[in-house]
Interface confidence: low
């Protein structure tokens, strides 16, 4: 016996969040693994005084304690539907079924005499059945449903009279079934019997307040136990080899302070309260825990030497149940002021370490949804994905023995003091109907899923690619909006005057008259900020780089009559230094912020944009931009993620979507102002970029979903696309989706009519697709009231906890970008497409692994995307070049300019193009790499500043 | 029966040092499952913790607060001492002191036992 | 820090139910303790660890506490029940205790 469970809790430091592993393995679980499904008697089979049963302490409990509940007799009549259940099982594949026997069905009164015939042939009926179809029956003897007449006659198991009858029942059941039956359980979560039965009250038979009468019943239960393990020992086991187990529940909890001795000392003992108070005496060394006899001396039974000797390893294998009743209501568990946690996992390793590394069965485990809930139990598939993950990594990483999974439940039932609130089956049940129909919920289909596939096969991304981006690709940094600033900071040659410092005497500086020298003219690195940008992008080995000019700085009054000349002339740097270097500019015009949107002052009181002015206003803005930098800029963003500024613009939907009318004049106005005006002389090009994640429904069994995804897509992309790429009006799909809500009176929002000057002014205007793409969105269909964008596109979203994500939740899901590319081409054709941002957040501030891990699986998909699906992807930009302070950590470089080391693996990937084969040449021709920079600096050199 | 009774001047200049004092009885300061802490509550506004020290000497601080506070007890006289520095007139408020329960020697279960509290003002 | 949002204020007529919530991130796996303050006097502790009731306090409290809302119940509501809320937890995190802003129940008539 081992005992060295609190080790647990001292993290391991290899742990690495890039190791996708350890969130989430794509892998099979053993052969032979054992997948089942359970239930408990008293939960499914109604019928509680049909046929001769007698009632147990439940039914008594249901009509004195649990308000508006009539009984269990609707449930889901398991004993009526037998043929239903067994159809259920066969849908979804298992190997085993754990369900009860209910004691009082068997023997009404509960002493063992002549067995309740009806009783008796029901459960022969079942087990004949399971065997016929190949599968395993693991039969509890004893899930809380104890019959009323022993707790009315000996006070139930607070009396050691229980622990005979309970043996006696036991033997019958083996004489009767054990022929068909290879793993037994005697009793279903002890724990939960002793606590809620007589300590909070919350369990039948309901009382509470006695911590000596708490104490008793589980030193009964164990005793009960541990006889009936000898019993079938020695009397069944040489004959019917099967096993015998006990079902031990636990939550599980995680310290507050994980370096913290008294934090971890606490969660140690209360794991050791709830589970090693039956795990010790069985699994471990015959007696209860050394914590719980010193702490509850007054109150805990004594074992005997000889009965410790009894108890120890009366268990042939360690079940294990870990669901929500250990976990609810919180307030009744020793949760000693630490964390509650859902890490099966841990747990997992916890009774290895403690245990001494048993055979494990999970014999209960699952979660619960609202009684409202019907066949699109969503959350459930995710919960059950994350548990199994869980189970998945326990097995192939921490050698721990678990041989066989039982998802809870079959079916939908009377959960306890929850009675039908919730539900938990995999299959729902309407039970108000007479037929009691067994519908398989999405989680049955994903279990049926899982148990086919052994495990999770990794459907979702292709094998990395060996290839390279072509020559002219664009590898780019995007830096936000770059203020600039207001005056040189080195004025030390504008100055005529000369000096001496009189360093003797009063050390000040004194001018010698009658003396000028000549000054020079100021310069592009007088500027302090530039230099530092420069040196950052020289690091970055980047052929170009996005950043957003100020438009409140360089026309403070919105329009033409004031220029702030020095701001242009600050740009103009930024730009021709960075030609210098060889890195082009992709300017962005306008990059609004949440603070005040980045509009000037004038524009913003006026109603921003929902003022149709504005756009005209940004028009003359960008005509200024595209005269002063034009010759030296080829690429322009007017607007950045104008989809976004739904998130400001949300009173209404209709100022939402007003909002964003004007925004795709402004941009029109402004391209079509280049096309006429700039591009015959500049030969530069213009789009717009919008924030382009990808949707995938949450719930892939659900169709609704997968109109919710598209429907996003719609709503999200198409709202901008449409009307620039295509036809110059917006996507009929989202028109006719906030029309149809309208009609309801489920909203008023209606999208702008749009005129056929209108259109005409829209359509057409962009030069290439530019796309903002971080992660992908898992999305449901949910019907929502209301007259807000948000609402009217009636999704929600749903952080799938096995995916690695960043600090801000941010999952990274690299193949969501591949498919976003093959959807724009789909949707609008073959062009040129530009990712235009795109980055993680890592709090990490030297050795950024999340990024490098984020930069490396998404250009993968790029370069899937450019080679296999050949979308015409013309350049990478990765966001953000330095990361802003009390804000995501989003740059390469730290606030205070220190490089972070994914600096070295974007200039890898840049050097070598991307992922080429072993050997092969990353060069591009001299003059390919280079034409450009020298028409470039060709400008910059007769441009005057 | 348990009770708590606060002690300290009525009023405070700007600047000077408040001492506040927490007299106890009906329990002892060294029972492992005792705890005390001080709460303050101005004119009509919410209540605000202060600081907190358990039975073995640990304490904790609110984090605003913390450079000005200091909490100790003499278990021998019964008392829990709060020492506010820098007073100034946003300090004035009702001071209270409360017990803490730590049931089973694990878990915080609230302050089941208040002071009827002391009104400082802070005023020049 | 640790931060409890409570709605200002609640009015309820005689005999009906008032429920008073707060709002914490993951407030489920904290035990939530919950005060009454009346016009002048200190706060008395009605609920403790979620759900729990001190000797002296009437049935009608009652608490629960799961998700990101734990809440106070007031059934059949009495005039004297007329005072400011404030629930409270123990912020593991930091050893700190965090209250509130408090919740004035007023009842009706």
């Known amino acids: 016996f081992s005992g060295d469970g609190r080790a647990i809790w001292s993290k391991n430091p290899n742990f690495t969040p890039v190791n996708e592993s350890q969130l989430f393995l794509y892998d099979t679980f053993p052969k032979n693994f054992f997948w089942g499904i359970g239930t408990g008697a008293l939960q499914v089979e109604g019928s509680w005084k049909k046929d001769g049963k007698g009632p147990s302490i439940w039914d008594h409990f249901i009509h004195t304690h649990l308000k508006n509940v009539s009984s269990t007799n609707g449930s889901s009549d398991s004993y009526i539907f037998l043929e239903k259940d067994l159809s259920a099982l066969d849908f979804i594949g298992v190997s085993f079924y754990q369900f009860s026997i209910s004691w009082p069905r068997l023997f009404p009164d509960g002493i063992v005499t002549v067995a309740n015939a009806k009783g008796l042939q029901y459960y022969s009926t079942l087990l004949d059945a399971l065997v016929l179809r190949n599968i395993e029956p693991i039969v509890t003897l004893y899930h809380w449903d104890l019959p009323l007449a022993l707790q009315e006659k000996y006070g139930g198991w607070k009396n050691d009279t229980i622990i005979d009858i309970f043996n006696d029942y036991a033997t019958y059941c083996f004489q009767m079934f054990g022929d068909r039956v290879k793993y037994w359980i005697t009793i279903h979560n002890p724990y939960l019997v002793a606590w809620h039965g007589y300590g909070t009250g919350m369990h039948a038979p309901g009382e509470k307040g006695n911590l000596a009468a708490v104490y008793t019943v589980g030193h009964n239960l164990i005793k009960a136990h541990s006889k009936v393990w000898h019993n079938y020992n020695t009397h069944f086991r040489p004959h019917q080899k099967g096993w015998l187990s006990i079902t031990l529940g636990s939550h599980w909890i995680e310290p507050n302070r994980s370096e913290n001795t008294m934090d971890i000392f606490k969660c140690q003992q209360s794991m050791v309260s709830v589970l090693g108070w039956f795990a010790n005496p069985i699994h471990g060394d015959g007696d209860y825990p050394e914590g719980m006899r010193k702490k509850l001396f007054s109150v805990l039974p004594i074992f005997s030497e000889a009965e410790k000797h009894e108890m120890r390893g009366t268990a042939d294998f360690f079940a294990f149940s870990f669901g929500p009743n250990n976990f609810k209501p919180l307030n009744t568990m020793a949760k000693m002021g630490q964390n509650v946690s859902l890490n099966l996992r841990e747990a997992l390793n916890w009774i290895k370490l403690e245990y001494n590394n048993p055979r494990i069965l999970i014999a209960e485990n699952g979660w619960f949804t609202d009684s409202r809930v019907k066949t699109e139990d969503t959350t459930a598939i995710y919960m059950m994905k994350n548990f199994l993950s869980q189970v998945l990594q326990a097995i192939r990483l921490d050698e721990i023995r678990v041989f066989g999974y039982t998802a809870w439940s079959l079916l939908d039932g009377f959960e306890w003091q929850d009675a039908y609130t919730i539900r938990r089956g995999l299959f729902y049940v309407d039970f108000n109907s007479k037929q009691k129909e067994r519908k398989p919920k999405s989680s049955a289909h994903y279990y049926k899923q899982i148990i086919r596939e052994n495990g999770f096969s990794l459907k979702e991304s292709t094998p990395d690619v060996q290839g390279q981006f072509p020559c002219d690709f664009s590898w780019g940094v995007t830096e936000s909006v770059l203020k600039p600033e207001s005056v040189a900071s080195s004025p030390q040659f504008s100055d005529p005057h000369l000096y001496v410092w009189n360093a003797t005497g009063n050390r000040l500086l004194h001018r010698v008259e009658g003396v000028r020298l000549k000054t020079r003219p100021a310069q592009c690195t007088d500027f302090v900020n530039i230099k530092k940008q420069l040196e950052m992008l020289a690091r970055m080995k980047v052929t170009h780089y996005r950043f957003a000019l100020d438009w409140a700085s360089v026309l403070p009054t919105g329009n033409l009559s004031a220029v702030n000349r020095q701001a242009l002339r600050y740009y103009r740097c930024v730009v021709s230094e960075g030609l210098k270097l060889g890195i082009s500019a992709m300017v962005t015009l306008y990059y609004p912020t949440h603070a005040h949107l980045g509009l000037p002052e004038p524009l913003l009181h006026a109603d921003g944009w929902l003022n149709p002015s504005t756009a005209e206003a940004f028009q003359a803005y960008a005509g200024l931009c595209f005269q002063e930098l034009g010759d030296l800029v080829k690429l322009w963003i007017t607007i950045n993620e104008p989809n976004r500024l739904s998130d400001i613009y949300n009173r209404s939907g209709n100022d939402t979507y007003g909002a964003a009318h004007n925004l795709l004049v402004a941009h029109a106005l402004a391209w079509r102002l280049y096309d006429r005006q700039f591009r015959p002389s500049q030969r530069g090009a213009v789009s717009l970029s919008l924030h382009a994640d990808w949707a995938e429904p949450a719930n892939p069994y659900a169709d609704s979903h997968w109109r919710a995804a598209e429907r996003f897509l719609q709503f999200e992309i198409a709202w901008f696309a449409e009307p620039l790429f295509k036809t110059g009006d917006y996507p009929a799909a989202m028109r006719e989706y906030i029309a149809s809500k309208h009609r309801r009176g489920l909203s008023s929002s209606a999208l702008p009519r749009l005129t056929e000057a209108e259109r005409r002014l829209l359509k057409g205007t962009v030069d290439f697709c530019a796309l903002n793409h971080f992660t992908t969105r898992f999305v449901m269909h949910e019907q929502l009231a209301g007259s807000r964008y948000d609402s009217d596109r009636d999704i929600q979203f749903l952080q799938d906890i096995t995916r690695l994500s960043s600090p801000t939740r941010l999952a990274v899901i690299p193949w969501g970008v591949r498919k976003l590319l093959r959807w724009v081409r789909r949707n609008y054709g073959d062009m040129d497409i530009y990712i235009t941002a795109s980055g993680i957040d890592d709090q990490a501030l030297e050795d950024d692994r999340l990024r490098k891990y984020y930069l490396g699986k998404y250009l993968q998909e790029v370069l899937k995307a450019y080679l296999i699906d050949k979308v015409r992807i013309k350049g990478y930009y990765a966001f953000k070049l330095a990361e802003e302070k009390s804000k995501p950590r989003f740059g390469f470089f730290t606030s205070d300019f220190k490089a972070k080391s994914s600096i070295q693996f974007y200039n890898k990937v840049i050097s070598s193009r991307g992922f080429p084969f072993e050997n092969s040449s990353s060069r591009c021709s001299q003059t390919q790499e280079n034409t450009e920079c020298t028409v470039c600096l060709f400008l910059v050199q007769k441009k005057p500043l | 029966q348990v009770t708590l009774k606060e002690s300290g001047p009525v009023l405070v200049k700007p600047t000077e040092t408040l001492t506040l004092t927490c007299t106890v009885s009906g329990f002892s300061l060294n029972n492992a499952r005792m705890g005390v802490s001080w709460i303050r509550q101005p004119p009509g506004k919410a209540l605000e913790w202060l600081a907190h020290?358990?039975?073995?000497?640990?304490?904790s601080y609110s984090t605003s607060l913390k450079s000005r506070l200091t909490i100790s007890k003499d278990t021998s006289k019964s008392q829990v001492v709060l020492i506010m520095t820098n007073m100034d007139p946003v300090d004035t408020a009702t001071y209270y002191c409360?017990?803490?329960?730590?049931?089973?020697?694990?878990?915080?279960?609230?302050?089941?036992?208040w002071g009827q509290g002391t009104t400082v003002t802070v005023s020049s | 820090s640790y931060v409890l949002t409570q709605p200002p204020s609640v009015s309820v007529a005689p005999g009906q139910t008032a429920r008073i919530t707060c709002g914490g991130a993951n407030i489920g796996s904290e035990s939530v303790h919950w005060y009454q303050q009346k016009p002048g006097q200190a706060p008395v502790l009605v609920v403790y660890?979620?759900?729990d009731r001190p000797s002296g306090i009437p049935e009608r409290f009652s608490g629960s506490n799961s998700g990101n809302t734990a809440t106070l119940t007031i059934s059949r509501v009495e005039a004297g029940d007329e005072a400011d809320y404030y629930c409270?937890?123990?912020?593991?995190?930091?050893?700190?205790?965090?209250f509130g802003g408090g919740t004035k129940l007023t009842v009706l008539g």
């Open positions: 020290i358990f039975s073995n000497d640990e304490k």
């Open positions: 660890d979620d759900s």
């Open positions: 409360a017990r803490s329960v730590v049931t089973g020697g694990y878990y915080y279960d609230g302050m089941d036992v």
């Open positions: 409270q937890v123990w912020d593991g995190n930091s050893d700190h205790v965090v």
